[in-house]
């Protein structure tokens, strides 16, 4: 008689990443008997919730349920029914909700309340919705990429599983760019982390890690753009803002009330003699770069060295994975290749920003104009942040790897978050049982 395959003994987990500009649902899967092994959890599905981030529903919280329906239904379809009740669901909200909470704790609580009620209606094991800290966001992103790269495994492999993987156990640093915040996380080389707020200690798989992390609230690409506009309109002579970060020929009317809606622009707020102003693109990379640099205060540093705004940053060490919007923007601009030097990236950005808006619209007809119009700014911002903000150089640029997925799983904080909450990263190295790592295929 033929051998019948035994039913898969697998487990599933769901994490919703409620970001400032959108929400994504991730479904993870792993063999039940290998929970403590490194690298066994993988992503089986990403469902991007259709619409903006949850913080935008503050005036219509009763509609959050509709907004989440489609992706929760997708989870119901992907995960076998027999597994529904034991599948944990976690929702973590990031900087968009941190900003809303700064404005009104009550409103932020109301949004999370409705999110919790909506998610509790599904047959899964809902574990709660919360606003994660910037420190957690950085730390979990770092755990995710190093877990997927196999950096926590004690067994050195003779092969590489991803193109940029070095064969040693040196961890990768993590660079995460969102819409409202950006995180930098890495293990510095024998360096004291001078500010306790930026220090994390982990013991993972029997090894100790002293990790530096910082999250810069308001320095995600969308909030950085609002900051830049608020700063530049202060010195505009009238309601026309000639902006080097937008393509020549581009025009857009901005409401002053929208500009000052976010806490991120409070420091630039002033009474203006107009309710609206018009952005007129002039498409000049160099001037755009200069304007962005004015958002980084580098005149004050109470430590041996800083990133910007008086925030401690140790000397950069090792390779870095740059993901989320770092990747999406650079991918759109076709600048993710390992072979592209920093000088080449700058050159390409100069050309891209100088292209007329009408030409850009024709070349990228399938892209929404709002997104399309902001790639010049976003690309320039990424260069400014990495070079002047974090002190990467033309030489160390080659240590930045723009990563979308590793082994089919998205780079980001969600996997690390789930691994932590399901206790799947042991402090000590698990005792290896014969063949438990599928040594023989």
């Amino acid at each position: 008689t033929q051998n019948k395959a035994l039913p898969e003994n697998v487990k599933y987990g769901i994490v919703l990443d409620a970001g400032s500009s959108h929400t994504s649902l991730y479904i993870y899967k792993w063999p039940a008997e290998k929970e403590n092994d490194t690298g066994v959890v993988h992503q089986v599905e990403e469902c991007r919730v259709k619409g903006p981030g949850i913080s935008k529903f503050v005036q219509k919280v009763n509609e959050i349920g509709i907004y989440l329906t489609d992706c929760m239904e997708r989870a119901r379809e992907v995960i076998p029914r027999s597994q529904h009740q034991e599948t944990p669901v976690y929702l973590g909200a990031t900087a968009g909700m941190r900003l809303l909470r700064m404005e009104s704790e009550e409103l932020a609580d109301r949004v999370l309340d409705v999110v919790e009620r909506s998610l509790s209606n599904y047959p899964f094991d809902f574990q709660g919705a919360r606003i994660i800290t910037g420190q957690e966001e950085g730390a979990y992103g770092w755990i995710t990429i190093n877990y997927l790269l196999g950096k926590f495994s004690q067994k050195t492999r003779w092969f590489s599983i991803v193109p940029y993987e070095t064969n040693n156990q040196e961890t990768f640093g993590a660079l995460d760019l969102g819409g409202a915040s950006t995180q930098v996380t890495f293990v510095p080389q024998n360096q004291t982390i001078e500010s306790p707020d930026n220090a994390l200690q982990f013991r993972l798989y029997g090894k100790d890690y002293n990790v530096y992390t910082h999250s810069f609230l308001c320095y995600g690409k969308d909030q950085a753009l609002w900051q830049k506009l608020a700063k530049d309109i202060q010195v505009a002579s009238n309601e026309i803002l000639r902006d080097p970060c937008f393509h020549p020929g581009y025009k857009k009317v901005v409401n002053v009330s929208d500009l000052y809606k976010t806490p991120c622009t409070k420091r630039f707020e002033m009474t203006l003699p107009f309710q609206q102003f018009e952005i007129q693109g002039i498409g000049n990379y160099q001037q755009c770069h200069q304007s962005i640099l004015e958002l980084f205060n580098t005149s004050y540093c109470p430590y041996s060295q800083c990133a910007f705004n008086g925030i401690f940053l140790p000397p950069l060490q090792g390779d870095f994975g740059a993901f989320s919007a770092f990747y999406f923007v650079m991918k759109f601009l076709n600048l993710t290749s390992e072979k592209v030097s920093q000088e080449k990236v700058t050159e390409m950005m100069k050309k891209f920003c100088a292209q007329p808006w009408e030409e850009i619209k024709t070349s990228y007809a399938g892209v929404k104009e709002k997104y399309l119009s902001e790639y010049c700014f976003s690309g320039t911002y990424i260069l400014s942040l990495l070079l002047q903000g974090y002190h990467f150089t033309a030489d160390s640029w080659e240590h930045i790897h723009f990563i979308g997925k590793i082994q089919g799983s998205d780079a980001g904080w969600t996997l690390g978050y789930m691994l932590n909450l399901t206790n799947m990263i042991p402090a000590e190295q698990p005792l290896s049982t014969p063949l438990s790592h599928s040594t023989y295929v």
Partner: antibody, heavy 121, light 106 residues
């Protein structure tokens, strides 16, 4: 402003296949699911299926499964619905549509103008 | 699949009269959406998420309900309101529509 423009009317013989297109503009193509709905003459509305251009994932109504294929061409922001093994009861107007929340959390629902498919020998 | 049953199938009214259309679901849904359709036109979203009027829909329209029973009400019929109305659930797949209610002039 979101626009969905469908291909023109089709006359097909029983047993043949038909492929209808729906070109979208005014938004980022990967942002929303694209749905297909059938309306036979003088009858009600029937959901056929949808596609998520972001992931490429499709869902079909069991009633049409096996005969319908929904695809997309991201380069032209166009969705297609192909119906095979046509029979007379497939004579209908077919609509493409999308719905969801825009960047300001306003709900919207937009439909194409419809494509009449006539199945007749 | 969730079956939606609309009643009545036809409603004959005069301008100024009140119209009430019901939609009953075979199992509980979180929200109901309503569409208006006129001859030769694509359906138009009229009420979304049970009670929210779509853009441009007059205030004489209202929606209510929960669970399995939902209602669309027109407080005082105007000539342009005579059309076919469909309910639709988007809570679970496959998405389903009610059979429609034709509101005609008496």
């Amino acid at each position: 402003e979101v626009q969905l423009v469908q291909s023109g009317a089709e006359l097909k013989k029983p047993g043949a296949s038909v492929k209808i297109s729906c070109k979208v503009s005014g938004y980022s193509f990967t942002d929303y699911n694209l749905n297909w709905v059938k309306q036979a003459p003088g009858k009600g509305l029937e959901w056929i299926g949808n596609i998520d251009p972001y992931s490429g994932g499709t869902r079909y109504n069991q009633k049409f499964k096996g005969r319908v294929t929904i695809t997309i061409d991201q380069s032209t922001s166009t969705a297609y619905m192909e119906l095979s093994s046509l029979r007379s009861e497939d004579t209908a107007v077919y609509y493409c549509g999308l719905y969801g929340y825009d960047d300001d959390a306003n709900y919207f629902d937009d439909w194409g103008q419809g494509t009449l498919v006539t199945v007749s020998s | 699949e969730i079956v939606l049953t609309q009643s009545p199938a036809t409603l004959s009214l005069s301008p100024g009269e009140r119209a009430t259309i019901s939609c009953s679901a075979s199992s509980s849904v979180s929200y109901m959406h309503w569409f208006q359709q006129k001859p030769g036109q694509a359906p138009k979203l009229w009420i979304y998420a049970t009670s929210n009027l779509a853009s441009g829909v007059p205030a004489r329209f209202s929606g209510s309900g929960s669970g399995t029973d939902y209602t669309l009400t027109i407080s005082s019929m105007e000539p342009e309101d005579f059309a076919v109305y469909y309910c639709q659930q988007r809570s679970s797949y496959p998405l389903t529509f009610g059979g429609g209610t034709k509101v005609e002039i008496k």
